[in-house]
Structures are given as C-alpha cells and as structure tokens.
Interface confidence: low
C-alpha cells in the first residue's frame, strides 16, 4: 500500500525549490524499478515529483490566501512491466500560513455623530478589521485594536473595535475629530502587521448654550404715523448651538409691553420690534424696553444651562410728525331755532394743532350757503331758517394749518333747527257737506280735524269754535271733542233750499303753542230736498250730490 | 486662527543652555501635543520631541536624549524647550508645531520660529 | 543621512507638473502615515498634505499626495512660480519612536 505523511507546505517561500515530503509504495524496495507520477491541477507546474523516490518539491513561491489546498493523484508503476503497483491514490497539500497579510478596514470610510458632553463609556461606533490570513493558525489573524489618533478624547476596547467617548467633548469648540484606529494582529505581538482607519466622529448638538444678545442696547426710532402692527427694526441674539437648539424666541418683559411687542423671525432667527399702540411725539417721544431671549426648545436635563435669560434694553425715539389738526370732539351737534335772524349764533367748534409748534387753525364749512364760521370756529346763520323745510343739516367742518394747508381734519357738523310756532292749525283736508231741508235740530252733519306744520313738544292740541259772526246768527253750531276733532250740528229744525240753498260757516281752529295762532277755516254747507224718507233727491249743486254718490231722480 | 509665538532670537556660548517658549492662543491649549523641530542654517528639518501640555508627558529623539527638556505650563498657555550643553552644530532655526505622535499624525500649526546661535 | 529618501532637486516650468518622491522602510512609511510640508523662503513649514492623501483647506487642488508600500509621491500640477519652495515628506517611524523628516527637495520653477 501506499505510504505517506500529512504533506504542508509554507506560503511565500523564496526557494526556487522546497521538498514538501515522499509518496512511496511499500512494495518498494529501493531498486529503482518503480516509476512515480503526479497527476492533477498543478502537477508539473507548481509541485514536481521525483519519479524514482517519489519526493515531491514545490518549485513556485505560494499564496495561502489565493489556494490554501491542493488536491493530486499519485500513481507508482513498475518499469519492467509497466503495471500500476498500487491503485491510484488521491492526496492533499495544506499551504500552512505565515503572517504575511495586513488587518484590512473594509467597511471605510467609518463616520460616527455622538452628542457633544455625552459621558465617559458612551458607544460612538465599532470598526472591524479582517485580516487574511489563517484564523487557526497561531495568532495570524488575531488583532487587537489601538487608538493612534484621538486621545484624550476617545478609546478603543482592544478586542473588539468598539470607541468610547473617554472625555467629554463640546461641540462650540470643536465638532468633529478624525480618530486613527490601529488594528495589529498576532494580538500586537513582534512581527505582527499593523493597518489603520480614519474614523469621522461628528458631535451632534445639544442645546448647553443659551441665547445671548449682540449688543447690550439697540436704539431704534418709529415714526408717530407709524400704524400698529410697523416693524420699527430688529434686534438679535447669537447662540453657539445649531439647529433646532439655536431657535430661540424674543418677548418683552412685562411691565414694558403695552406699546411694543417683539415676534421672533424663526428664518432669521431675530426679533422683529413691533409698534402695538400708536405712538404721539407730543405725548412721549421716548421709551425704553427690556426685551429677553430664550431657546425655544429646551430639555428639561439641560435647563440648568438657560437658568437666566439673556436681556437688552431697547430705547425707542419717537420721531415727530407734522399732523392734521385735531377737532376737541370727533362731530359737533348744534341747535338754532328756526326763523332766527342772518347772523345769529350757532356754536363753536375748535381744533388745535397737535404739533409743538401749535400752527394757528382756519375753519371753513364745506357746501353751505345757510351758515358761516369765522377763524375763531364760532358758527352763524348766513340765511333765515325754516324748519318745516329743513329740520336738519349734515355738514362737514374742515381746520386747515395756516403754516401747512395739506395739513386738514374734516369732522362732521349736524344742526338741528328747533321749532317755533309759526304755523296755525287748518282742516286737513277741504270739507264740503249738504243738509236735508227737514233736517231736525241737533243733527251732526259733518265731524272736521285739523293739522298743524309745526312740530310740538307735547302733543299737538287743537281748539274748535265758530266765528263770532256764525255763533251769534248761525244755523248750525259746534262741539270740540276735546281730541283734535270737532262736529257741526244743525242748530235749528228745518231748511229752505230756495231762500238759502248754502251755508258757509266759518270755524276757528287754535293751536296750544306759546303763543297760540288761530286760522279761520270756512265750511260749505248745501241744502238739499231729500224726500221723506231722507234720500236725497236735489240740491241745487248738482255736482255736489253726484260727487257724494247720492241718488238723483 | 491658531497662533503659537514664539520667544526671540538667542545667541549663547558653547556648554551653555538655551530656553525658548511657545505661547499658544485661540484654541484648547490642553488637548494638543506640541512637538519641537529645528532646522540648522541650509539643511533640513529634524525632529527634537513632544510633549502633551496637560500631563507633560514627553517623548524625545533619541539624538536629544538628556540634553533636552520640554515643560509646559497651563497657566499661560506656554510651552518650553531647553537644550544643554550647547555645540556650535546647535546653531538653528528652532520651531514649535502643534501634533505629533498619537492626538495628531501631522504638525498643523507651526511657530514663527527662533534662531539660535551658538558661538564662542 | 535622512532616514526618508527625497531628491534633493527638482524643476519643472509653469503649467507642468511635477513629482517629488519619499522613500522609506517597513517601520515608517510601510506602517504609517506620510504626511508633506512647504518651506517657503524665510518662512516656517506649513503643512501641505497629511494622512497621505489629504489636503488641509486653502491648500489648491493642483497638489495631491500618494503612498504605495514603503515610498509616497507628492504631486504638483499647473506648476506656479508660487510654488518654489522646498519640500518636506515626513512619517513616525516605529523603530526609531519618533519622528522622521525626508532631506528635503528645492523645487525650482523655471
């Protein structure tokens, strides 16, 4: 049978031939009548066998990590017969490893983001290094890590590739640090192969900053025109944080917010000072705020570091403006009675400059022909008023400044015209009636009411009566029914159309006003036949008759 | 921007010791090596030391062993270099640069340097 | 004698580039970083390339840093009259502990 060791060869061997060991057959006796032969890949070309004694030999340099086994065949023959002496048999060639590969990084480049201040022992990230070489065989391919770069800050645990931070780190001094990672193998042992990585550690922001104001004093100035809700100008804090921790918000303190109010521009991140109340210079033309700063996001493990607020003090100079003139009140109300003479007196409105210069004031009343106004503001009728044609006027009053006419107020003027009684009471409407010829005593025959143009305080109350002439020879008479109406009654039995076919009776009416007026108002009165069972049938006004709808034969 | 300045020039006797300072500014004194290089009249640059500030832990060439002392003092944020028993082949340009071994695998800052000149 | 091998010259004119070599062993650039310094004319060094192949900002483009095994390049390209300077190659060296500096090349723009 067939007769040989385990066969290895070592890697990288320089020789130009290096013998591995011998293949024999125990039949062989040392003659030299057996012939060997090397069969499969690399037979001839990488291993070469003595064909007499069977000694193999590796004539090119090997790479373990390219091929770390062979497989070939062996046969043995005998020369005189040329037979196999023994069956064809496989065997093996190990290339046994030397420490020829380096530890390699192969998952670079590494980056790694921690939070600034985070404490000694935290993970920041693990490298791993793979090394080439045999893992079974001696410490080839065992590694232990080093730190090349990055003291004192980071740490590397020796087996495992794992950084720690070692010391904390601020993010405002530094952001980020390129640690150097050393991977040696045969455990750091001499001769061991030693590779490197970069490591990018970024630290992340955490919010240990708070907002501080750039200036200790912003001076800003706002017009008195300015209407509310102006930006006057901007103030801003600086916060060594990024990001969303940087985001802070502006206010003012509260005593000092009535007239100014700050909103935060979260793009800018400054503080917009806003006019909240419009601002007078003649009232105050200065003001002086305290605004403050904070983070408009703040853990509650890092509020230690925002314990007090960053504040400025803002002074606000208010700039004058050359105003309008300003009436005492926003309209005038005035009364006049009517019929009160050209000339008479009104009212007075005044307006005074705002301004520090106190410009003297010119008034005049726009679209009117019934009243005038002097430079004192005093008001008087130009025209004769009439309240049952006018009981009102809407007006507008404009003050202009003397030394700036563009500079005008309008305000709006109303005049009520009071009454007086200058109108008597008439009918209200005309009053035209008949009576039948046999008409009895007492009858009414007519019931009459009367208006008056004017305007009464109290209710408007109205006295009936006949004129002196009718009361003393009149055929009819009157009764007031004590509520502005009164009726005419006959005042005798009987009526001759043919003697005296109409009446025309005369009726005083008074007012109640002080002093009363009376007018005189005349009532006609036909006389009719109007047959026995009162129908009428003629009068001598035709018309009259027809007008009234009554029947004629 | 870093600045590291450096002492004025010294001319010494031979046998005699030279101290030159480094003053550093604008950043953390503390987490930087500072190494040491000089460089004589037309020749290269050669390599004397390093110390770290903060525990004064030091390293030097072996050419320098015994002849040179680096200190560093926290306080002002300075950094010292004393050579001993001068020769006149100690004439030389000296510079501080901040890095060196371990924290920083270069020398990103270099000092103005100090010329000194040894002469009997 | 330098433990890192520089040629003590180099030249090239405007426009070209140039390449200056550092050789060095195992223990040094074999195991380390290589890292390039510019020495202007009465001036300190100031650092050029470091971790091989990285540039510090402000430094142009047109120079780029390389290593292969035990020797590293540095590369100029678009040569400038403002690069005449000498040029240093340095690296730790685990041997020796310490620091070491290549002899240093003049670089002369014609």
């Known amino acids: 049978g067939w007769v040989w060791n385990q066969f290895f060869v070592p890697e990288e061997m320089n020789t130009t031939s290096h013998h591995i060991g011998q293949l024999r057959s125990d039949l062989d006796n040392g003659n030299n009548s057996f012939q060997y032969k090397l069969l499969g890949a690399g037979a001839g070309s990488t291993f070469i066998i003595d064909e007499r004694t069977g000694d193999i030999y590796a004539i090119q340099k090997l790479d373990r990590e390219e091929r770390s086994l062979y497989i070939l065949r062996a046969q043995v023959i005998d020369i005189a017969t040329g037979r196999a002496v023994e069956p064809e048999s496989e065997f093996v060639i190990k290339v046994s490893d030397i420490n020829d590969n380096e530890p390699k990084f192969l998952d670079e480049p590494y980056e790694a983001i921690v939070p600034e201040m985070s404490p000694e022992g935290t993970l920041v990230i693990q490298v791993t290094a793979s090394d080439a070489d045999d893992p079974s065989s001696g410490n080839n391919a065992r590694l232990l890590y080093s730190l090349l770069q990055g003291q004192p800050y980071f740490s590397v645990e020796p087996t495992t590739g794992v950084i720690r931070i070692s010391s904390k780190m601020d993010r405002e001094l530094q952001d980020e640090y390129w640690v150097i990672i050393q991977a040696k193998d045969m455990i750091g042992q001499p001769g061991a192969l030693s590779g490197t990585t970069s490591v990018l550690i970024k630290l992340s922001d955490v919010n240990d900053n708070k907002p501080i104001f750039k200036e200790s004093l912003y001076r800003l100035t706002v017009s008195e025109s300015a209407p509310t809700g102006t930006s006057i100008g901007t103030i801003m804090a600086y916060d060594n944080d990024i990001g969303e921790n940087a985001e802070m918000d502006y206010s003012i303190e509260e005593d000092d917010s009535q007239t100014f109010d700050i909103i935060t521009n979260h793009e800018t991140q400054e503080g917009i000072v806003i006019l909240k109340k419009k601002v007078d210079f003649e009232h105050q033309n200065h003001y002086g705020i305290r605004a403050k700063v904070k983070n408009h996001h703040v853990p509650e493990q890092l509020m230690k570091y925002h314990t007090e607020a960053s504040t400025t003090f803002i002074k606000i100079q208010v700039e004058d403006v050359d105003e309008p003139p300003l009436f005492l009140l926003p309209y005038y109300v005035f009364e006049v009675f009517e019929e009160t003479p050209q000339g008479s007196f009104v009212g007075v409105v005044s307006a005074t400059d705002p301004d520090n210069r106190k410009s003297p004031i010119r008034y005049s009343i726009t679209r009117s022909k019934v009243f005038n106004i002097n430079d004192n503001g005093t008001i008087t009728t130009s025209n004769s008023l009439d309240r049952e044609i006018s009981a009102w006027y809407n007006l507008s009053i404009t003050a202009t400044e003397k030394y700036n006419i563009e500079q005008i107020s309008s305000i709006p003027l109303y005049v009520q015209v009071l009454n007086i009684n200058d109108h008597a009471p008439e009918f209200s409407q005309y009053y035209e009636t008949y009576v039948c010829e046999n008409a009895g005593s007492g009858q009414v025959i007519q019931t009459i009411s009367a208006v008056d143009r004017d305007e009464s305080i109290e209710e408007h109350h109205f006295y009936f009566n006949l004129s002196v002439e009718d009361t003393n020879n009149s055929s009819f008479t009157i009764i007031d029914n004590q509520d502005n109406t009164a009726v005419i009654l006959t005042n005798r039995t009987g009526f001759n159309l043919q003697e005296e076919p109409v009446f025309y009776i005369s009726i005083l009416i008074a007012d109640n006003g002080i002093p009363s007026l009376t007018s005189t108002n005349t009532l006609t009165i036909h006389v009719c036949d109007c047959g026995d069972s009162g129908s009428t049938q003629t009068c001598q006004y035709q018309e009259l008759v027809l007008s009234m709808g009554f029947k004629t034969e | 921007q870093v600045q590291l300045v450096q002492s004025g020039a010294e001319v010494k006797k031979p046998g005699a010791s030279v101290k030159v300072s480094c003053k550093a500014s604008?950043?953390?004194?503390?987490?930087?090596?500072m190494s040491w290089v000089r460089q004589a009249p037309g020749q290269g640059l050669e390599w004397m030391g390093i110390?770290?500030?903060?525990?004064?832990?030091?390293t030097y060439a072996q050419k320098f062993q015994g002849r040179v002392t680096m200190t560093g003092d926290t306080s002002t944020s300075t950094v010292y270099m004393e050579l001993s028993s001068l020769r006149s082949e100690d004439t030389a340009v000296y510079y501080c640069?901040?890095?060196?071994?371990?924290?920083?695998?270069?020398?990103?800052?270099w000092g103005q340097g100090t010329l000194v000149t040894v002469s009997s | 004698q330098s433990v890192l091998t520089q040629p003590p010259s180099a030249s090239g004119t405007p426009g070209q580039r140039v390449t200056i070599s550092c050789s060095g062993s195992?223990?040094?650039?074999?195991?380390?970083?290589v890292n390039w310094y510019q020495q202007l004319p009465g001036t300190a060094p100031k650092l050029l390339i470091y971790t091989n192949n990285q540039r510090p900002s402000g430094v142009p483009d047109r120079f780029s840093g390389s290593k292969s095994g035990t020797s590293a390049s540095l590369a100029i390209s678009g040569l400038q009259s403002e690069d005449e300077a000498d040029y240093y190659c340095?690296?730790?060296?685990?041997?020796?502990?310490?620091?070491?500096f290549g002899g240093g090349t003049k670089l002369t723009v014609l």
């Open positions: 640069a901040r890095g060196g071994i371990k924290l920083w695998l270069h020398f990103d800052y």
């Open positions: 604008r950043y953390t004194f503390t987490s930087y090596y």
């Open positions: 340095a690296v730790w060296d685990d041997s020796l502990n310490g620091w070491v």
């Open positions: 195992r223990s040094n650039i074999g195991s380390n970083f």
């Open positions: 110390i770290h500030p903060s525990g004064g832990d030091t």
